[in-house]
């Protein structure tokens, strides 16, 4: 099976790497524009220069291209707690990230929110906080893990998953209650 190619890919594959086929004349291969620039005018003929112009402020191209316009720079989502790691340049988009002791939770492939790393109070750090993953905690005896926080077994209801972890405590509480009914 031959992989399906879009019109642009088909046209580009006729020319050597770093060149693209002239949109009005398929016998001409024009040199692509360098990153940080965009296509202003196609080359007039074989061996002649493509007219490439530098991206304006607030826009970029990160690879060689024959785009008619530069791409708009991304803006960091302050409402999601994001901070700017590096600002946009003509050849590189804005890089957004999180503050120290925070991790990214991805809502979708390109939308993330910053959350504080768990401190594992009443427990120990099993796996340290990573760029895209919260700390993994192990709880001390008498505590169980709920939403990555160590919660006292006194808050464990029989219907919850914590019953196995907190079984001795629950039995003790039950035993204490029973002993008062003589």
């Amino acid at each position: 099976l031959v992989p399906h190619l879009g019109d642009r890919e088909k046209r580009d594959s006729v020319c050597p790497q770093g060149k693209y086929i002239h949109p009005q004349n398929n016998s001409i291969c024009c040199t692509k524009c360098h990153k940080g620039t965009y296509l202003y005018n196609d080359c007039p003929g074989p061996g002649q220069d493509t007219d490439c112009r530098e991206c304006e402020s607030g826009s970029f191209t990160a690879s060689e291209n024959h785009l008619r316009h530069c791409l708009s720079c991304s803006k960091c989502r302050k409402e999601m707690g994001q901070v700017e790691i590096s600002s946009c340049t003509v050849d590189r988009d804005t890089v957004c990230g999180c503050r120290k002791n925070q991790y990214r939770h991805y809502w979708s492939e390109n939308l993330f929110q910053c959350f504080n790393c768990s401190l594992c109070l009443n427990g120990t750090v099993h796996l340290s906080c990573q760029e895209k993953q919260n700390t993994v905690c192990t709880c001390h005896a008498g505590f169980f893990l709920r939403e990555n926080e160590c919660v006292s077994c006194s808050n464990c209801k029989k219907s919850l998953e914590c019953t196995k972890l907190c079984l001795p405590q629950i039995e003790n509480v039950k035993g204490t209650e029973d002993s008062g009914t003589t």
């Epitope: 979708s108 492939e109 959350f115 990555n148």
Partner: nanobody, 117 residues
Framework: EVQLLESGGGLVQPGGSLRLSCAAS????????MGWVRQAPGKGLEWVSL????????YYADSVKGRFTISRDNSKNTLYLQMNSLRAEDTAVYYC??????????RGQGTLVTVSS
């Protein structure tokens, strides 16, 4: 095919409450991030609130923090938005949405919330 059906919108007085519901089908709801998006008259789409598959992570727009609560019932494939202390500026069409690469691609038909005296 992702299908999202909102209900619960209506006319409410300032300070009043509404609870929006969203019935989801056509995908694995349990493990999916979900949210509510709104579009006020003449404005763009904005995320109001988001919740992850297990309900551990949530997001609230600054304008609704402390007033709105997002929740989900994975056994019913349903997403909720409890809206309290409603204000005139909350008037908008509210959409149930599944975040995607193009942020607002997967959303329902919307339910109109009007806050007016």
């Amino acid at each position: 095919e992702v299908q999202l059906l909102e209900s619960g919108g209506g006319l409410v007085q300032p300070g009043g409450s509404l609870r929006l519901s969203c019935a989801a089908s056509g995908f694995t709801f349990k493990g999916s991030n979900m949210g509510w998006v709104r579009q006020a008259p003449g404005k763009g789409l904005e995320w109001v609130s988001l919740i992850d598959g297990r309900g551990q992570h949530t997001y609230y727009a600054d304008s609704v923090k402390g007033r709105f609560t997002i929740s989900r019932d994975n056994s019913k494939n349903t997403l909720y938005l409890q809206m309290n202390s409603l204000r005139a500026e909350d008037t908008a069409v509210y959409y149930c949405a599944k975040p995607s690469v193009r942020e607002f691609d997967y959303r329902g038909q919307g339910t109109l919330v009007t806050v007016s005296s």
